[in-house]
């Protein structure tokens, strides 16, 4: 427990004095926070926070569910923990299975244990499919499993936590990675056309077509040397997993002469930005 | 770099026990992946356990569990295997590896980036 000189504050003081309890299901958790400015305990697992203002936390039937960190806190904000596994041997597993990814980035897949002294926690493909060889992860038993740099390659990837108990494989519910693309080049874009000659009065419309992995890329189409909003429509499909296109359709229903000039269509996203032009040229009408 | 030490290997009778250590030195802060293999000659690498530094998660395959135990001593940087109960089968240059973080595949040697030079144990009957 934490010792701190005398005058300065010092963080509550937990019985009993130490940072992971294991109970079995069923049995009592009696928590007791000793501090002169107590203010509350907090319970945290997952998304779940609740919180107890009596300075002894008591769950008289202790259930899986009740795994999770209990943090007592006093009046000068300082806090103490004791992380509690309510060992079920129904219920290995405490999970969330919302489980997005970004490309390169780490992903942690919701499982903590309730029970800390199971053995071969790790990830399973669903229905004995292999995992990618190139995945690694990192184990937590409070908090899951930390897939290391995700891969594009690994969207939709179906999965199990698992873990060893009396020699046999347990798995847990089933979780569908979802990997948002990193941006790893720039937008192509491409114009319908490259140059219009018109009438005074005639239709001016333009399609610039926007490719990339995913939707969040940034488009407009901008008239060089002005600030004026111009009127878009857009079109857009995914066609499969990382093939975003946009379809962004200019148009200016009756062309006037001060119209003509040069229409820029841009798109930029994290990587970097690209355009493409094109070259109004309206006449008037003799 | 990271540089791997085992030590305690030897010759023991059948039914003996023995302790192995791996100490690590070097960038060992971020590597969280440590195992044990074997290698008998003539043979395959062979995954004997593994341990998780942050979190203490243990791997072992079936053969194994019950006789062998991993552990580790985290103010030492080393990991331990506890061998009992030791059969002539078990002979074997037993290696420590390490890496960032465990592959899908945790049995498979060929995914471990970092290595001792081993130590032999000899079960003699």
């Known amino acids: 427990q934490p010792s701190v000189s005398p005058g300065e504050p010092s963080p509550p003081s937990i019985h009993p004095g130490k940072s992971d309890l294991i109970v079995r299901v069923g049995d009592e958790i009696r928590l007791l926070c000793t501090d002169p400015g107590f203010v509350k305990w907090t319970f945290e697992i997952l998304d779940e926070t609740n919180e107890n203002k009596q300075n002894e936390w008591i769950t008289e039937k202790a259930e899986a569910t009740n795994t999770g960190k209990y943090t007592c806190t006093n009046k000068h904000g300082l806090s103490n923990s004791i992380y509690v596994f309510v060992r079920d041997p129904a219920k290995l597993f405490l999970v969330d299975r919302s489980l997005y990814g970004k490309e390169d980035n780490d992903t942690l897949v919701r499982c903590p244990l309730t029970d800390p002294e199971v053995t071969n926690y790790s990830l399973k493909g669903c229905q004995g499919k292999p995992l990618p060889k190139d995945l690694r992860f990192i184990p937590d038993p409070k908090a899951g499993i930390m897939i290391k740099s995700v891969k594009r390659a690994y969207h939709r990837l179906c999965l199990h936590c698992s873990v060893d108990q009396e020699g046999k494989s347990v798995l847990s519910e089933k979780f569908i990675l979802k990997v948002r693309p990193a941006f790893k080049a720039v937008p192509v874009v491409s114009v319908s056309k490259a140059s219009y000659l018109l009438r005074e009065g005639e239709e001016f419309t333009v399609t610039c077509t926007i490719k990339d992995v995913s939707s969040s890329v940034y488009s407009t189409w901008k008239r060089e040397n002005s600030q004026t909003k111009l009127q878009e429509k857009y079109n857009s499909w995914h066609h499969g997993d990382f093939n975003y296109e946009r379809q962004a359709t200019l148009t200016i229903s009756s062309a006037r002469v001060n119209d003509s000039g040069v229409f820029m269509c841009y798109a930029n996203n994290t990587f970097g930005s690209a355009n493409v032009t094109t070259t109004l040229e309206v006449v008037d009408k003799g | 770099e990271v540089q791997l030490v085992e030590s305690g290997g030897g010759l023991v009778r059948a039914g003996g026990s023995l302790r192995l250590s791996c100490a690590a030195s070097?960038?060992?802060?971020?590597?969280?992946?440590r195992a044990w293999f074997r290698q008998a000659p003539g043979k395959e690498r062979e995954f004997v356990a593994a341990?998780?530094?942050?979190?203490?998660?243990?791997y072992y395959p079936n053969s194994m569990k019950g006789r062998f135990t991993i552990s580790r001593d985290n103010a030492k940087n080393t990991v331990y295997l506890q061998m009992n109960s030791l059969k002539p089968e078990d002979t074997a240059v037993y290696y420590c590896?390490?890496?960032?973080?465990?592959?899908?595949?945790?049995?498979?040697?060929?995914?471990?980036?970092?290595w001792g030079q081993g130590t032999l144990v000899t079960v003699s009957s």
């Open positions: 590896a390490a890496d960032e973080s465990f592959p899908a595949y945790y049995s498979d040697y060929a995914l471990y980036r970092y």
């Open positions: 070097g960038r060992t802060f971020t590597y969280d992946a």
């Open positions: 341990i998780s530094w942050s979190g203490g998660s243990t």
